[in-house]
Amino acid sequence: NFMYSKTVKRLSKLQEYQQYYPSLTCVMEGKDMEDWSCCPTPWTSFQSSCYFISTVMQSWTKSQNNCSVMGADLVVINTKEEQDFITQNLKINSAYFLGLSDPKGWRHWQWVDQTPYNKNVTFWHSGEPNSPDERCAIINFRSEEWGWNDVHCHVPQKSICKMKKIYI
């Protein structure tokens, strides 16, 4: 009976999400393997988040709006491990917008989800950021490593969206 009611709840939750995400990929987790954590298909998952790489070239603001429509934000990178996971799926000759910007050009960087900007957990390429006119951040491959660079916000780039996993 308990299992039956849990299944019914799950199905109704799945139906609820189906209007936003036609297809979800779920894995069982938790100590009794009773919880399902899901990401929209074909998003990838790492820890408690889902990631989507958009190859559409758009400005930073349009990229953020595009993520927002999908219930996500441009990616906020919190750890080196998270960055290493994300970069496994990126092309080395491309650049991707992050959810990091400095709209006033005062070098006051801010994450789109209001996560405090911690200078000690940043992965800027050497010499970056280097221009107050370049107010948005990308991740790209340079000098044999992935890192961040400040660029002009209005110039179209690819982007990475991030959202919390859906638990059902």
Epitope: S59, W60, P103, N130, D133, C136, C153, H154, V155
Partner: antibody, heavy 121, light 111 residues
Framework: EVQLVESGGGLVKPGGSLRLSCAAS????????MSWVRQAPGKRLEWVAT????????YYPDSVKGRFTISRDNAKNSLYLQMNSLRAEDTAVYYC??????????????WGQGTTVTVSS | DIVLTQSPASLAVSPGQRATITCRAS??????????MHWYQQKPGQPPKLLIY???NLESGVPARFSGSGSGTDFTLTINPVEANDAANYYC?????????FGGGTKVEIK
């Protein structure tokens, strides 16, 4: 006083080349992004090329990509536009404009008087 | 590309009256309260001159008779009261994404 003075316009045959120059004064040229904007007779303004302050980025619309090259010499306070494979539709007044960044975009706060380019056989 | 449509194409206004020009963008040029629409004045044989930046900010040295408003896709430039030397073409421009684009212009004539 900010001044932008263009030169180098003229009459050229289709397929020909021309190099426009813009001499800047009255401000720290190396600190600003610069653009070329053109205006065909009786038409709207059209952005042609942008170069970032540090010379690290150049941008072009599809209509001129591969034919036009923007460059700058910060030591000489000068902006250039090399125009190759010119077409009749490139006929316009070409303005040099200074960019001022605002939030996620920018605007053109100073413009030169313009130089006329006529492409005709 | 973002297309900017200005209306009217031309208008004739008497000195002391109000002139209103609108600019409609094919998609939003606003983001989190910042509106990346700008206005320029161009007199015959002269380069454009910046009047208003970011929808409503008056450029230094521009008379307070000029004002701008709007957000999203719809923006307005108002001249009130109009003076004889306001006869010119007026253009809107967006810069939220490349390529920066301009409106087709509005010709203001003084009656």
């Amino acid at each position: 006083e900010v001044q932008l003075v263009e030169s180098g316009g003229g009459l050229v045959k289709p397929g020909g080349s021309l190099r426009l120059s813009c001499a800047a004064s009255g401000f720290t040229f190396s600190s600003y992004g610069m653009s070329w904007v053109r205006q065909a007779p009786g038409k709207r303004l059209e952005w042609v090329a942008t170069i970032s302050s540090g010379d690290s980025y150049t941008y072009y619309p599809d209509s001129v990509k591969g034919r036009f090259t923007i460059s700058r010499d910060n030591a000489k306070n000068s902006l250039y536009l090399q125009m190759n494979s010119l077409r009749a539709e490139d006929t316009a007044v070409y303005y040099c404009a200074r960019q001022l960044y605002y939030s996620y975009g920018y605007y053109f706060d100073y413009w030169g008087q313009g130089t006329t380019v006529t492409v005709s056989s | 590309d973002i297309v900017l449509t200005q209306s009217p194409a031309s208008l004739a206004v008497s000195p002391g009256q109000r002139a209103t020009i609108t600019c409609r963008a094919s998609e939003s040029v606003s983001f989190h309260g910042t509106h990346l629409m700008h206005w320029y004045q161009q007199k015959p044989g002269q380069p454009p001159k910046l009047l208003i930046y970011a929808a409503s900010n008056l450029e230094s040295g521009v008379p307070a008779r000029f004002s701008g408003s709007g957000s999203g896709t719809d923006f307005t430039l108002t001249i009130n009261p109009v003076e004889a030397n306001d006869a010119a073409n007026y253009y809107c421009q967006q810069s939220i994404e490349d390529p920066p684009t301009f409106g087709g212009g509005t010709k203001v004539e003084i009656k």
